[in-house]
Interface confidence: low
């Protein structure tokens, strides 16, 4: 599992995302905040795509989820897969692209603020061997059983975005995890590319809000591709 890998701390010898880009096993670990990144390989084109090993959804980009690449495949071999768009089949929320959630096996828009009335329903769905299952919650003793009814405000400790109030997401914040605001138009966002840029984010931004996507700032002319700012922009 991810935890056992982390605990062994063979950080510099790990495959991506924990040890930097593929082919750069000595890449430094960017710890506070940020991604484990090697710098130069941060923004690679899709042409250079290589399957991205992962152990849980948080290791993948905001537009991806962690799963076995083959249906019924070896659960031990998981990679980051592109998120499912609206009306596509799903088994859990993380499979659906930002702004959507998994309901009755289909990715649907989260416009209706579904967590208010449907959290009990969705949480008890059978998601298989997944961190989002009810069993997954029962092992976390830090949360009370009332957590579904009292949504975390900005800065509250959380486990996942469903713990947070509307307009907030649950994101890593240094060595904790708290509710943070979903990004608005013009705000800097984190654009994950396919190779060498994922990883355990110690400081994690929320995703862009409804109708926005994370794209390179048009007027941001910089010498290096890797240092271009990404901001939330209208589709």
């Amino acid at each position: 599992t991810l935890n056992s890998v982390l605990n062994s701390n063979a950080i510099k010898n790990l495959p991506p995302p924990l040890g930097g880009a593929a082919g750069h096993p000595g890449s430094a670990v960017s710890a506070a905040p940020g991604i484990l990144y090697p710098g130069g390989n941060k923004y690679q084109t899709i042409d250079n795509y290589q399957p991205y090993p992962c152990a849980e959804d948080e290791e993948c980009g905001t537009d991806e989820y962690c799963a076995s690449p083959t249906r019924g495949g070896d659960a031990g071999v998981q990679i980051c897969l592109a998120c499912r768009k609206r009306r596509k089949r799903c088994m859990r929320h993380a499979m659906c692209c930002p702004g959507n959630y998994c309901k009755n096996g289909i990715c649907v828009s989260s416009d209706q603020n579904h967590f208010r009335g449907e959290i009990e329903e969705t949480i008890t769905e059978s998601f298989g061997n997944d961190h989002s299952t009810l069993d997954g919650y029962s092992r976390r003793t830090t949360l009370s059983s009332k957590m579904y009814h009292t949504k975390g405000q900005e800065g509250s400790v959380c486990l996942r975005s469903s713990d947070c109030a509307s307009g907030l997401c649950c994101a890593r914040h240094f060595w904790s995890k708290i509710c943070k605001p979903v990004l608005k138009e013009g705000q800097v966002c984190t654009k994950h590319r396919r190779k060498g840029s994922h990883g355990l984010e110690i400081f994690q931004r929320c995703y862009c809000g409804e109708g926005l996507s994370c794209r390179i700032q048009k007027d941001h002319h910089q010498a290096s591709n890797s240092s271009r700012l990404h901001t939330c922009q209208r589709h």
């Epitope: 905040p33 830090t142 240094f174 060595w175």
Partner: antibody, heavy 122, light 112 residues
């Protein structure tokens, strides 16, 4: 008030083990990452290990990797450092420190214990 | 690993006079999120370290305003506008941009 109290230090022979504890009080321990930092006699500070708020993520300095294990028990508000295969160069004062943060800032290590002394000698 | 260096390694100051300590990192501490993860600590004799400055220039709560931090990239400075007797000790800079976190060797400040 916010307080960290280390214990478990002592004199130990090379190759033996020791377990340090750090008792936290005055804050919500389970919401904070925690560090161990050491200081050899007359020397500077050396970061040893860090553990995330829930114990899922752990990182170590190369000098202790494979020998030391950081862990925590949030129900007891206690941080631990299990030190195995101790060497003379592990002799130091060991401090636990809180990984402080606010919504917009990371404070580094904002609260420190008084330290506990570990002496590795034959 | 990021190597932190400090100059001078020792400093003798007259009370009421200013003091300045330099800290350099082997690579930039500017993170892609726009923040710079450089900290200053003071360790008074017989005590644990205490946080003075976080993220280059922010004074931690309770730290007197005679302490100030500045710098960017790889070069940083801690200034004490008017040194007082209670400021004696060893000053350390630390980076937390990258694991492992690393400290400078320390600058010992005493009173003339």
């Amino acid at each position: 008030q916010v307080q960290l109290v280390e214990s478990g230090g002592g004199v130990v022979q090379p190759g033996r083990s020791l377990r340090l504890s750090c008792a936290a009080s005055g804050f919500t321990f389970s919401s904070y990452g925690m560090h161990w930092v050491r200081q050899a006699p007359g020397k500077g500070l050396e970061w040893v290990a860090v553990i995330s708020y829930d114990g899922s993520d752990k990182y170590y300095a190369d000098s202790v990797k494979g020998r030391f294990t950081i862990s925590r028990d949030n129900s007891k508000n206690t941080l631990y450092l299990q030190m195995n295969s101790l060497r003379a160069e592990d002799t130091a004062v060991y401090y636990c420190a809180r990984a402080g943060y606010s919504l917009y800032y990371y404070y580094g290590m904002d609260v420190w214990g008084q330290g506990t002394t570990v002496t590795v000698s034959s | 690993d990021i190597v932190m260096t400090q100059t001078p390694l020792s400093l003798s100051v007259t009370p009421g006079q200013p003091a300045s300590i330099s800290c350099k990192s082997s690579q930039s501490l500017l993170h892609s999120d726009g923040k710079t993860y450089l900290y200053w600590y003071l360790q008074k004799p017989g005590q644990p370290p205490q946080l003075l400055i976080y993220e280059v220039s922010n004074r931690f709560s309770g730290v007197p305003d005679r302490f100030s931090g500045s710098g960017s990239g790889t070069d940083f400075t801690l200034k004490i506008s008017r040194v007082e007797a209670e400021d004696v000790g060893v000053y350390y800079c630390m980076q937390s941009k990258q694991l492992p976190f690393t400290f400078g060797p320390g600058t010992k400040v005493d009173i003339k």
